[in-house]
């Protein structure tokens, strides 16, 4: 049997609006007063087990005490009424949970969506947090008929239990209710067919065209409520390696369709496509994107000839010379397909020509010392590129005209080369470069630039702190012009080692120091100057700076019969490096001098 409580707190289920004041009362039963020899002045109010300050408490009469709270902010408080029986024993009389929060805001932004094949889902913005249990009910009706209420589980959306009826307008609104109030949203009126989100198109396939290398044909299956709806499409595509999508203009896909030809594509390129659909009126929602499908455009003949150059080997006697024709494989964007081979035609005169079919990117031919014209075309399964033409002049012809003001400089981690064109019209320029080294041969790389170019960067994989010899040759219709060369670094560093100094001649008061240039492999940059530091065992160090063109230097005003320690450092633009220390002793007397 449960014991009757000694009293009650009113209200029994208090809910308070945050920031407002609230008063509760505790009423003791008469029997309780007599049993414990107490009255209302013995009441102790507690919130979450902590005594409420006396100033918040009012004794109304012998049975009733009230407590007042101002600016209530805590979401939940345990409020208890207790009595001090027999002067000191605290006895709980009654307890309630005091909740605080806000009345519901008027729901806004009510929207509904009919996901194809599912019931209608409506969503709304409930406004600020109420901090209280709040019921949201989605109401819907026709002009003549009410539909079942939809009780929201999450307070922001609800999926109705009935299938939508299309082509009849429905009215929808949300009611929100909690202990502090009840409110309704504005109602919305619509035809569910205008809220449809179709399922994504499927079976997307991509086919190419042998006739046109710039198109791909797409076909797909649309749903649209089983053909009940006419849908328009949105098509996007990208190259296989790209991250951004290209949009097919929406005006091109406005009419209902299940196929489309995408134009202006690059030949022999793999493209990825995706497609989505919406009701052709534009009302409703775009479907999710279809699964991606890819296809490759058909090959086209190469769009340009390869870069083309030659190197002449020393001639075998006087009658003929060996010429190595070299070219670069076309990038995919210009090859427009798989390059099967190259056609090289060498013509000495109208009556003498020789044709070669080459699978690699070089061909060595033997030519007399006459003038020849070499042409080169790349071939894929569709056809041949235009021909690159090179005139190979007689070795007895001296090349005239070269570029002027040739410069090279590093910028943005690239090695740039610029020049002023020669005064005669140029067909193209050839840039050649290699690493200068005393330990390995200069293995050349090269690139071709159009006639309009007079500034470019070297396109190979360049190494830092290596000395590059760069040569620029203008090519004319009559053959190559003169070549101009220079040295450059992608990035300089301090030398790997400093110069080793030695004495060439030592006198009583001077010494001629000599050193070798640092090998190019150890220079790591342009040697700008040297410093020579010298000292005696007791004197202070002296430093002299020497221009990098020198390989010897005379120290003067030295003391006789003295040991000197000398060291040299070499400096590039990026710092210096000391060589080993060297010692020498000046003689006591000059040559022929007697004590």
């Amino acid at each position: 049997q449960l014991l009757e409580p000694c009293g009650y707190i009113y209200p029994e289920f208090p809910v308070v609006q945050r920031g407002s004041n609230f008063t509760a009362i505790c009423v003791l039963k008469e029997a309780c007063l007599q049993h414990y020899y107490v009255n209302a002045s013995y009441i102790v109010w507690k919130t979450n087990h902590a005594a409420v300050p006396r100033e918040q408490v009012t004794v109304i009469n012998r049975t009733t005490s009230s407590v007042t709270f101002t600016d209530v902010v805590l979401p939940s408080v345990q409020l208890t009424c207790n009595i001090l029986s027999f002067g000191q024993i605290e006895q709980n009389v009654y307890g309630v949970t005091m909740l605080s929060g806000f009345p519901p805001d008027k729901p806004t932004n009510l929207t509904c969506i009919v996901n194809e094949g599912k019931n209608m889902l409506c969503q709304w913005d409930p406004g600020r947090e109420t901090y209280l249990e709040t019921n949201y009910t989605l109401k819907s009706e026709w002009a003549t008929e009410k539909f079942p209420d939809c009780q929201s589980k999450h307070g922001t959306s609800c999926m109705v239990s009935y299938m939508p009826t299309y082509y009849v307008n429905i009215e929808v609104w949300v009611e929100a209710e909690n202990a502090l109030g009840k409110v309704s949203s504005e109602s919305i009126n619509f035809d569910p067919v205008d809220k449809v989100k179709p399922t994504p198109p499927y079976n997307l396939s991509v086919t190419n065209s042998e006739e046109l290398s710039s198109i791909l044909k797409l076909s797909w299956v649309s749903s649209g409520l089983g053909g009940l709806l006419d849908l328009k499409s949105d098509i996007q595509y990208r190259t296989k390696d790209a991250s951004t999508w290209i949009q097919v203009p929406l005006e091109d896909t406005m009419s209902p369709r299940t196929s489309f030809t995408v134009q202006d594509l690059k030949p022999f390129t793999e493209y990825v496509f995706r497609i989505r659909s919406i009701k052709d009126s534009g009302k409703g929602y775009w479907s999710d994107w279809s699964e991606e499908a890819s296809g490759t455009t058909y090959e086209d003949r190469p769009s340009r000839p390869p870069s083309f150059w030659y190197k002449t080997n020393p001639s075998h006697g006087q009658e003929y010379r060996s010429v190595r024709l070299i070219w670069k494989a076309l990038p995919l964007s210009e090859a427009n397909g798989k390059i099967l081979d190259y056609e090289v035609i060498l013509t000495q005169s109208k009556s003498v020509s020789q044709t070669y079919t080459v699978t690699g990117t070089e061909l060595t031919v033997n030519l007399t010392n006459d003038r020849y014209v070499a042409s080169l075309a790349a071939r894929n399964k569709v056809g041949k590129s235009a021909a690159a033409v090179l005139t190979i002049p007689s070795p007895h012809v001296t090349a005239a005209y070269s570029v002027v003001n040739l410069k090279a400089f590093p910028k943005d981690n690239l090695l740039w080369v610029e020049w002023t064109p020669p005064p005669k019209p140029v067909s193209k320029y050839i840039l050649e470069w290699c690493v200068l080294s005393e330990n390995a041969p200069c293995v050349e790389d090269w690139q071709q630039e159009d006639a309009t170019v007079n500034r470019t960067h070297l396109r190979g994989r360049l190494l830092e702190s290596k000395c590059y010899q760069i040569t620029v040759t203008p090519v004319f219709a009559t053959g190559p012009g003169g070549s101009e060369s220079l040295k450059a670094y992608l990035k300089q560093a301090a030398p790997a080692r400093g110069p080793t100094v030695r004495t060439k001649k030592v006198g009583k008061n001077e010494a001629v120091l000599a050193w070798d240039q640092i090998p190019v492999d150890d220079q790591n940059g342009f040697i700008r100057n040297y410093s020579i530091s010298y000292r005696t065992s007791v004197g202070k160090e002296m430093v002299v700076h020497v221009d990098s063109s020198h390989t010897e230097y005379t120290l003067s005003s030295l003391s006789s019969d003295t040991l000197y320690m000398v060291r040299m450092a070499a400096y590039t633009d990026e710092g210096g490096k000391d060589g080993p220390e060297f010692t020498f002793t000046t003689p006591k007397f000059a040559q022929g001098e007697i004590e």
């Epitope: 009658e319 003929y320 005169s349 020789q354 033997n366």
Partner: nanobody, 125 residues
């Protein structure tokens, strides 16, 4: 590697005929033209006849014009020298040669890079 193998040499009476053959192999690209040369002991090697492998243009030394004919069978990679009305002065070692030098057909021996071992032709009275 490149090889040239001559055959068909031998002894013949003046006024007689011989047909020399030369089979070529090992070329990445076919030679531009081929030729027949002969050498008599103690004398320089001299050009007899040449033929372009592409168009079949031919060239003959004045001393053999009208008597000798150079021809080829591309399918068999073979070059022939048909020798009629042989004279005593036609005696010598006959060499087949090939070149990849791109120029008009020539019997200048300095333009030829590849040579066979030779086949002996002897004309007696």
């Amino acid at each position: 590697q490149v090889q040239l193998q001559e055959s068909g040499g031998g002894s013949v009476q003046a006024g007689g005929s011989l047909r020399l053959s030369c089979v070529i192999s090992g070329f990445t690209y076919r030679p531009t033209f081929m030729g027949w040369f002969r050498q008599v002991l103690g004398k320089e090697r001299e050009g007899v006849a040449a033929i372009t492998t592409g168009g079949g243009s031919t060239l003959y030394a004045d001393s053999v014009k009208g008597r000798f004919t150079i021809s080829q069978d591309s399918s068999k990679n073979t070059v022939y020298l048909e020798m009629n009305g042989l004279k005593l002065e036609d005696t010598g070692m006959y060499y087949c040669a090939a070149t990849t030098v791109i120029t008009s057909v020539s019997i200048n021996r300095n333009l030829y890079q590849y040579w066979g071992q030779g086949t002996q032709v002897t004309v007696s009275s």
